[in-house]
Structures are given as C-alpha cells and as structure tokens.
C-alpha cells in the first residue's frame, strides 16, 4: 500500500511535471511566438485513456517529437533549452510511471496540435494531483 511519504513524493513529482508542461505551453502559445502557426501544423498522438500514472507511457513516447517541435521555437521569446527540458520531463515520467510493468499505450484515432497535446497532459496532471490531495 502507498505510504503518505510516497504519496507526497508522487504529488511533488506531478506538480513538477505540471509546471514544466505549463512552462512549455506558456512559452509557445502566445502572440510573441513567430513560429506558432508553423508549430500548429505538427501532429501529436493523444492517449485513448489517461487516468492512471501508467498512462504516462503515452507521454513518454511523444517526448522526442515534442523536442523536435520545440527546437523551432528557439527565439528571444522562448528561453528554455528543449533538450534539457525534455530530459527533465523524461526523468520525472519514468519515476512516476515506474518500470516494473510494461504498459502498451493505446492512442486515440484523432491526432492533436502541440497546444491540444500539452493541455491534455496538463489536465491529466491536475486530475491526478486532485485525487492525491
């Protein structure tokens, strides 16, 4: 059974992941981003279901495409280094989903823009955090 300390650790990791995802979204989805229109042409796979930590497998599998799109955003407006940012997210995702069980991610039929993709995972983090608090 999860202890209060492990629950707290999970909550902190989710909060960290949430802030990272929000930081990316804030950095690209604004009127100072000259590349936004181009970035919105890239398609991302969305999870068919995302209600448990194991479903973070679906996020992990899209981190490489995410990094590639973020590389387009490098400007005075976007102050994050995509490689470092995605690396940090990857570490948190691996810790959160655990490696004991292998989970095959199921994707929805419809693809999404980077903004829809990030918003979906932000909502996921917020939802799980609310169940922990």
């Amino acid at each position: 059974a999860p202890t209060s300390s492990s629950t707290k650790k999970t909550q902190l990791q989710l909060e960290h992941l949430l802030l990272d995802l929000q930081m990316i979204l804030n950095g690209i989805n604004n009127y100072k981003n000259p590349k936004l229109t181009r970035m919105l042409t890239f398609k991302f796979y969305m999870p068919k279901k995302a209600t448990e930590l194991k479903h973070l497998q679906c996020l992990e599998e899209e981190l490489k495409p995410l990094e590639e799109v973020l590389n387009l955003a490098q400007s005075k407006n976007f102050h994050l280094r995509p490689r470092d940012l995605i690396s940090n997210i990857n570490v948190i995702v691996l810790e959160l989903k655990g490696s004991e069980t292998t989970f095959m991610c199921e994707y929805a039929d419809e693809t999404a823009t980077i903004v829809e993709f990030l918003n979906r995972w932000i909502t996921f983090c917020q939802s799980i955090i609310s169940t922990l608090t």
Epitope: M23, N26, G27, N30, Y31, P34, N77, H79, I122
Partner: antibody
Amino acid sequence: QVQLVESGGGVVQPGRSLRLSCAASGFTFSSYDIHWVRQAPGKGLEWVAVIWNDGSIKYYADSVKGRFTISRDNSKNTLYLQMNSLRAEDTAVYYCARDGEQWRGFDYWGQGTLVTVSS
Amino acid sequence: DIVMTQTPLSSPVTLGQPASISCRSSQSLVNSDGNTYLNWLQQRPGQPPRLLIYKISNRFSGVPDRFSGSGAGTDFTLKISRVEAEDVGVYYCMQATQFPTFGQGTKVEIK
C-alpha cells in the same frame, strides 16, 4: 502624449461588412504591436486580434478567425480591422490597445467605437 | 484558453477603507522567460479600460500608490489601501502569458 482614436463603427446588418480604423499619435507607431479588444454592452472584455509592429505576424481569437482581418499602415500611423460576415454576437465597443513596452499586456487604450449588428 | 476567475464580483466599500480583489488563473502564468504577465485594469463608468498594474506588482505611470498588486503562479490580488470616490468602477485582471484573457470583472462601489 500617447493617443489612440478609433472610428468606423455603426449599425450594420448581419452578414455585412465594416472596417474600423485606429489612428495613433504621440509615440513611434511602427515600434509597437497593437491589439483589438472588444466589450459587448454590459459585459466583460474579450481579446480579438493582434498585429506585430512590422505587420509580419497576426493572430486572432477563435471567435473571429476567418471573418476578421487586422492590418496596419505604418506610414499613416493607422491600424485597421476589416470585419466580414458580421453576426449579432459581434455587437460591442471595439477598442484598439497598444502592447506594453518590454512586457505584455495593454498600456494605452483608445476611447472605443461601437459596432451594432442588427437587422 | 487560460480562464481567469475573479472574486468577489461586487465589492461595496466605505470611503477611506481598504478593498481587495482576488484573481485565480486555471494554469500557471509563469512564462519561459521567468516573467508572469498578469495585469490589472480599471474601467470607470463610461470610460475605456486603463492600466493600473503590470507583471503582478508594477504600478503603471500615474497610478496612485494606494493601488498594489501581489501574488504568484495562479493566485493574485489587487489591493486598494484606502478607497476614494474616483476608484468606483470595474476592475479586471488579465493574463498575457498566453493569448490574452480577462477575468469577469469586479464592481467596486461606495456603500
């Protein structure tokens, strides 16, 4: 002093078009991004569109995308909003607002021009 | 879109007394450049909006020092230390970290 003066508002039938203007003075117009923001009667504020200082980038709210076009003429210090396929829900006071210097948001606003869409 | 929620929606205040307005965003407003683009606007009756505070706590030029802003992340507050008659109107918080969105507005009136 910074001044923004809107014009071009009026009563128009649904489906028709209207062009708003915003004349700027008191600052270097070509150095600033400019926005249109609207306010329906008795309601709150809604961002409509923005155009970069050099006119190269334009973004729109989903509610007006494909119907409204923002443009500017830096030689005339004037901003425009071409509004096509107007709907009743576009009825509002339309304000032009200057983007902040070194930060984001709106530091100076015009007095507004009222657009009424009604049959 | 980021949703901005203000409380209260109406605030009857006695002249000379303090007033406080809260604003909460549906997501963090911290941008990748480290700035938080949260601003406060005042709209007096029959007037266009006017900027009071930008980037959480910076007073715009000509704004009296009785107005102050504070907060971080998703929770922000505008305070008027001593309400004067000319402060009557509607106050809006707005974010420009993403595409601009506004709170519903808080009507400040004299009791």
